[in-house]
Interface confidence: low
């Protein structure tokens, strides 16, 4: 999906008002220095590409993020403020249904959400400082 046509300011507002708080809730009890940020992005469309990938694509050791509150709100924000985004997500929805039903917070998931927090922060302060 090409995120260049999204309404970035509206997505930023959704992040600041709710998504950021849900990410903090998910990470509660984890030291902010526990994980190093290894994923970055160079501008807002690129950040959204990385955010979508980390939030909705199951990874080894963390298959359940798509059911979390921050993920559902992220999906809603992208669906509302990115033209045509919903149509591209039919396959992703099928993958979500196949994800395990119980919410299991593994260390790998915590690390992934820590990366997401960094990506969202970068989304709000775009421009990668080095490529």
């Amino acid at each position: 999906y090409d995120f260049t046509n999204c309404d970035f300011e509206k997505i930023k507002a959704a992040y600041l008002s709710t998504i950021s708080k849900d990410l903090i809730t998910y990470m509660s009890g984890t030291k902010s220095t526990e994980f190093n940020n290894t994923v970055s992005c160079s501008n807002r469309p690129h950040c959204l590409t990385e955010i979508q990938s980390l939030t909705f694509n199951p990874t080894a050791g963390c298959a359940s993020l798509a059911k979390e509150m921050f993920a559902m709100k992220t999906k809603a924000a992208l669906a509302i403020w990115c033209p045509g985004y919903s149509e591209t997500q039919i396959n992703a929805t099928q993958a979500m249904k196949k994800a395990r039903k119980s919410k299991v917070t593994t260390n790998k998931c915590l690390e992934q959400v820590s990366q997401l927090q960094g990506l969202w922060r970068r989304f709000n302060r775009p421009l990668l400082k080095q490529q």
Epitope: D2, T4, S42, N43, P45, R125, L127, K129, Q131
Partner: antibody, heavy 117, light 107 residues
Framework: QVQLQQSGPQLVRPGASVKISCKAS????????MHWVKQRPGQGLEWIGM????????TLIQKFKDKATLTVDKSSSTAYMQLSSPTSEDSAVYYC??????????WGQGTTLTVSS | DIQMTQSPASLSASVGETVTITCRAS??????LAWYQQKQGKSPQLLVY???TLAEGVPSRFSGSVSGTQFSLKINSLQPEDFGSYYC?????????FGGGTKLEIK
């Protein structure tokens, strides 16, 4: 309305340090990055570097690392570029330009620097 | 660093004609490319960003497109005010680089 007002033309002797200013108005200074671009007479555009006014973090391309120093004064919403030990190669028009996503929606009017003995 | 190769370096055309300027990136920069117009003695002005999004106030005769690593700026029905220099610039990540420029002159 958004404006980037640069300092006037400067004539400097080789080796004498020079400082160019870029005063921003009409928007939140710390929200946007400030970039600097060089254009030699009759030539194309060359990216020098950028500064984040919110925390003064700077990035300069290798060839300008020992030449340019970027600073900001948040209280006056002004960005500065200082060029050390200028030579004739530094004679050019220097532009400041603001950006969020890497493209420049507003530019300063340019500052002409002439290095001559 | 990403290199931007712009062509042609110069171009002569008449008012009313359609012209296309191209820019090729040395690697994949997705849609992260901007186009600027610069008149003699003036600052560059943003025309297009994200390869195909028209900047505010830019006439609809300007359009941007992308195919892989090749980007194009098309100007339909040239107007007298369209003559000047045009530059592409990638905005994918540091260091930002510009194409060498295209000088568009009146035939």
């Amino acid at each position: 309305q958004v404006q980037l007002q640069q300092s006037g033309p400067q004539l400097v002797r080789p080796g004498a340090s020079v400082k160019i200013s870029c005063k921003a108005s009409g928007y939140s200074f710390t929200t946007y990055w400030m970039h600097w671009v060089k254009q030699r007479p009759g030539q194309g555009l060359e990216w020098i570097g950028m500064i984040d006014p919110s925390d003064s973090e700077t990035t300069l391309i290798q060839k300008f690392k020992d030449k340019a120093t970027l600073t900001v004064d948040k209280s006056s919403s002004t960005a500065y570029m200082q060029l050390s030990s200028p030579t004739s190669e530094d004679s050019a028009v220097y532009y400041c330009a603001r950006t969020l996503d890497g493209y420049y929606d507003y530019w300063g009017q340019g500052t002409t620097l002439t290095v001559s003995s | 660093d990403i290199q931007m190769t712009q062509s042609p370096a110069s171009l002569s055309a008449s008012v009313g004609e359609t012209v296309t300027i191209t820019c090729r990136a040395s690697e994949n920069i997705y849609s992260y490319l901007a186009w600027y117009q610069q008149k003699q003695g003036k600052s560059p002005q943003l025309l297009v960003y994200f390869a195909k999004t028209l900047a505010e106030g830019v006439p609809s005769r300007f359009s941007g497109s992308v195919s892989g690593t090749q980007f194009s700026l098309k100007i339909n029905s040239l107007q007298p005010e369209d003559f000047g220099s045009y530059y592409c610039q990638h905005h994918y990540g540091t260091p930002w680089t510009f194409g060498g420029g295209t000088k568009l002159e009146i035939k």
